[in-house]
Each structure stands twice: as C-alpha cells, then as structure tokens.
C-alpha cells in the first residue's frame, strides 16, 4: 500500500480520522522540523489549525520580531504559532481564516475570511485577505487592503507613531487599524477604555479588551 503522507495541517489530521480536538504534529512544506499545533475539530466542521490563542493572560505577547517569526507559547494554552510557519502553511494551498472571539459578558462571535495567506519575511509577513463574513461586525476588523506585520522592534505600520510599541504585541497594524488580538490581556472590570488591549473594533469598539480569541486556518477545499 502507499506510504502514509505526513499531515500538512489539521485538515489532513481530520481527514485521516482523528476528529478529537487536541495537539497534533504536522509536517509543513519547506520547514526542517515538524511542528506541534492545536487542532480544533469541533468548530464549523473541524479541521482547523490554530495559529493564535488567548484565554487567560498567562503568556506575554509583547515580544520582538524573532519571537513572532518562530512562535512562542504552548499549543495546549496561549500561543502564537509563528509567522514563518503561518507563511509556510498558507503557501501549501489556499486557506480560509476563522477568528473566534469572546467578550467578558460571555458573548461569542466570529469573523471568517474566504482567503488568507501572508507574505514571507522579506515582505514583512504582509497580510492578504478576501471575503469577510461573520457575526463579529459587518465590517472587517482586519485590514483587507493589506498590512505589514509590526513588532516592538520592527515598525512597519502606516502611522507616524509606533503602533506595536504603543498598543503592545505584534500585529498587522495600519495606523493603527481596527484590531489587535495580540494586545495586553486585561481582566474583567479592567478591560474598558484600553488603547492597548485585545481589540476587535467592529465587535466591541475601539477600546474594549476581549476575554478570549482563537485564530485558525483551514484549506479552502476541505
């Protein structure tokens, strides 16, 4: 029989019969090492590779370019997969992006994009998106016309300011744009009126810091 092909992403994992959410090892094209990721097999049909997760403020997201490049945290909890891995995965085939959000009142919402990929490091991991739908606002809180990734030590935004320093965290800032899911984690009662919180403008406004976020990707042809 044919030799089993390694999993490229969580869609491959799901289609191989593993339909329980959890940590799996995937083998991404052009990456020398396998990568442990959290696979969400429950939301909207499953097969989602989680690239970002926030839930309790246990992990510091105010990090530099190199850390955002290679990733940090643990897929069992809060983590950022790493821009190099996100670039490599989304270069394999066409992907969609789903973002799950929850506020401090327990309200859940999502934003979904029909197409998602990012550029390579030379392109500052530029964000490419198409086709926004979802319940987290009629308008997209991610920049649709393209934005470069910025960190505290790499200012690639379109502001006279330094968005990543001011608003904390690495993100696809514009000036500074309507979102930042890698901002400071604020607990209930402290989460209002914050410039540098976990923001999704068209869900909860410009200065409300969210309770939890998950960014996940899945092949378009899943």
């Amino acid at each position: 029989r044919e030799e089993e092909k390694p999993f490229r992403d969580c869609a491959d994992v799901y289609q191989a019969g593993f339909n329980k959410s959890g940590i799996y090892t995937i083998y991404i094209n052009n990456m020398p090492e396998p990568k442990k990721v959290f696979c969400n097999m429950d939301v909207n049909g499953g097969g989602w590779t989680v690239i970002q997760h926030r839930e309790d403020g246990s992990l510091d997201f105010q990090r530099g370019w190199k850390e955002y490049k290679m990733g940090f945290g643990n897929p069992s909890g809060e983590y950022w997969l790493g821009n190099e891995f996100i670039f490599a995965i989304t270069s394999q085939r066409q992907y969609m992006l789903r973002i799950e959000l929850m506020d401090w009142e327990g309200n859940r919402a999502y934003s979904q994009y029909d197409r998602f990929h990012i550029g390579n490091e030379k392109q500052n991991y530029r964000l490419y998106l198409k086709g926004h739908t979802g319940t987290a606002g009629k308008q997209s809180s991610l920049i649709l016309h393209g934005a470069d990734f910025s960190t505290k030590d790499a200012d690639n935004d379109n502001c006279m300011c330094k968005c990543a320093l001011m608003l904390t965290g690495g993100w696809w800032f514009d000036a500074c744009g309507p979102s930042n899911l890698n901002g400071m984690f604020y607990t209930a009662g402290q989460n209002h009126g914050k410039l540098n919180g976990i923001k999704w403008h068209y869900f909860k406004g410009p200065s409300y810091s969210l309770r939890s976020t998950t960014m996940m990707i899945r092949p378009l042809d899943f």
Epitope: P178, G193, N196, H201
Partner: antibody, heavy 122, light 112 residues
Framework: EVQLVQSGGGVVQPGRSLRLSCAAS????????MHWVRQAPGKGLEWVSY????????YYADSVKGRFTISRDNAKNSLYLQMNSLRAEDTAVYYC???????????????WGQGTLVTVSS | DIVMTQSPLSLPVTPGEPASISCRSS???????????LDWYLQKPGQSPQLLIY???NRASGVPDRFSGSGSGTDFTLKISRVEAEDVGVYYC?????????FGQGTKLEIK
C-alpha cells in the same frame, strides 16, 4: 502621502457667514476623526471642533457653540466648518487636523492642513 | 477646562547646547487607559504645527532623536539634547485627557 488642503478663508463682516473646506488625500479619510484648530494673529493654538470618523460624534469649544457647525462627507474625502454669526474675535488662521490614530482613538493631531486665514472686520 | 502652563515662554539657545521646556497641567493627565495624553508640537515660522511627541514620551516618525519627552501626572518636560538652527519656532504642549483639548501658551525657541 497624507495631504490636507484647505480653502474658503477670506475677509468677512461681523455677523456674516463663511464656510471652510479641507480636502483630504493619501489616507482612508472615513477611518479618522477630524478637528478644527485656530490661531489668532500672534497668539497660541485653540481647539475649535471635532467630528468622529462616521460623523456621529461632534464636539465644539464653548466659544463657538451654537454658531459653528462641523461636518464631513466621507464620499468626497472632505471636512467642513460652517461659521455663522462671525465676530471680530473669530479672526484667526484655521487649521484642519487629522487624528494621529484611526478608528476614533484620539492621541493628538498627526497631520495638519496648511491653514486658512479668516478675517472678521467691518 | 484644564490649564496648561509652559515655561519658559522665551528660550534663547546656543547651537549645540541642550534646551528644556516645562509643561504643567492643572489636573493629572494620566488617563484611565494608562497613558498620559500629552503631546508636544513645534510650529516653525510661517508653517503649520507638526507633531513631535505623543503620549508624553513617544517620538513621532521622522522626529530626530535629539528630541525627548518625559513626565507623568501634572509635570512634563520636552528636552532637546543639542539644539540645531532648524529647531527654531514655537513649542506647544497639549493635553487630551480631559475634554476639551487644551494647549499651553507656547515657548519660543530662538538661536542666540
């Protein structure tokens, strides 16, 4: 390149009206709060009015409340200041200014127009 | 309204020497968002004002690193480590913590 180009200044008699315009380019105008700031001859800067990105929130300085009206047309990338019942003390260079940050997060004025002189004199 | 008081109002400086401008507010400018909403602007002769420092201590893009802002609460300072001829003009501090926004009366920097 961000540009704010102003027009509409001039000499006007007390009690009359004037409309200032500010044409924006080089950025997504509909994402930014906008302000009018004025400077009387030889004096300092004075904030006049603010309008949010969608136009839903508006503020005025007490000195102009009830006489001045700020508005915007996002389709035309333009900001306006309608000045009625003008007084001698309204004589100043008027600047339009854009918020530094988008989405109505105000941390100051990132960009300024070139200014337009309004002289109120009989 | 918040009163912003700058000193000195006039500042003659020799090129290459440091300069310092003080700005005091009648109430604390520490906003509930955790930032001091205090900016510094420079208005060069015959020009529109330009942003130098935002949120008390953050230098705007393109502003030379000889400019620095510091302070918190009610007391703020703009420092120029080595004054150059192109730095002449009127410097204004401005607060945005309490509505309406208010400016200091300005400090005129001139070359000796």
């Amino acid at each position: 390149e961000v540009q704010l180009v102003q027009s509409g200044g001039g000499v006007v008699q007390p009690g009359r009206s004037l409309r200032l315009s500010c044409a924006a380019s080089g950025f997504t105008f509909s994402s930014y709060g906008m302000h009018w700031v004025r400077q009387a001859p030889g004096k300092g800067l004075e904030w006049v009015s603010y309008i949010s990105s969608s136009g839903s929130t508006i503020y005025y300085a007490d000195s102009v409340k009830g006489r001045f009206t700020i508005s915007r047309d996002n389709a035309k990338n333009s900001l306006y200041l309608q000045m009625n019942s003008l007084r001698a003390e309204d004589t100043a260079v008027y600047y339009c200014a854009r918020d530094l940050l988008d989405y109505d997060i105000w941390t100051g004025y990132g960009y300024w127009g070139q200014g337009t002189l309004v002289t109120v004199s009989s | 309204d918040i009163v912003m008081t700058q000193s000195p109002l006039s500042l003659p400086v020799t090129p290459g020497e440091p300069a310092s401008i003080s700005c005091r507010s009648s109430q604390s400018l520490l906003h509930s968002n955790g930032y001091n909403m205090l900016d510094w602007y420079l208005q060069k002769p015959g020009q529109s004002p330009q942003l130098l420092i935002y949120l008390g201590s953050n230098r705007a893009s393109g502003v030379p690193d000889r400019f620095s802002g510091s302070g918190s609460g009610t007391d703020f300072t703009l420092k120029i480590s080595r004054v150059e001829a192109e730095d002449v003009g009127v410097y204004y501090c401005m607060q945005g913590t309490h509505w309406p926004p208010t400016f200091g009366q300005g400090t005129k920097l001139e070359i000796k």
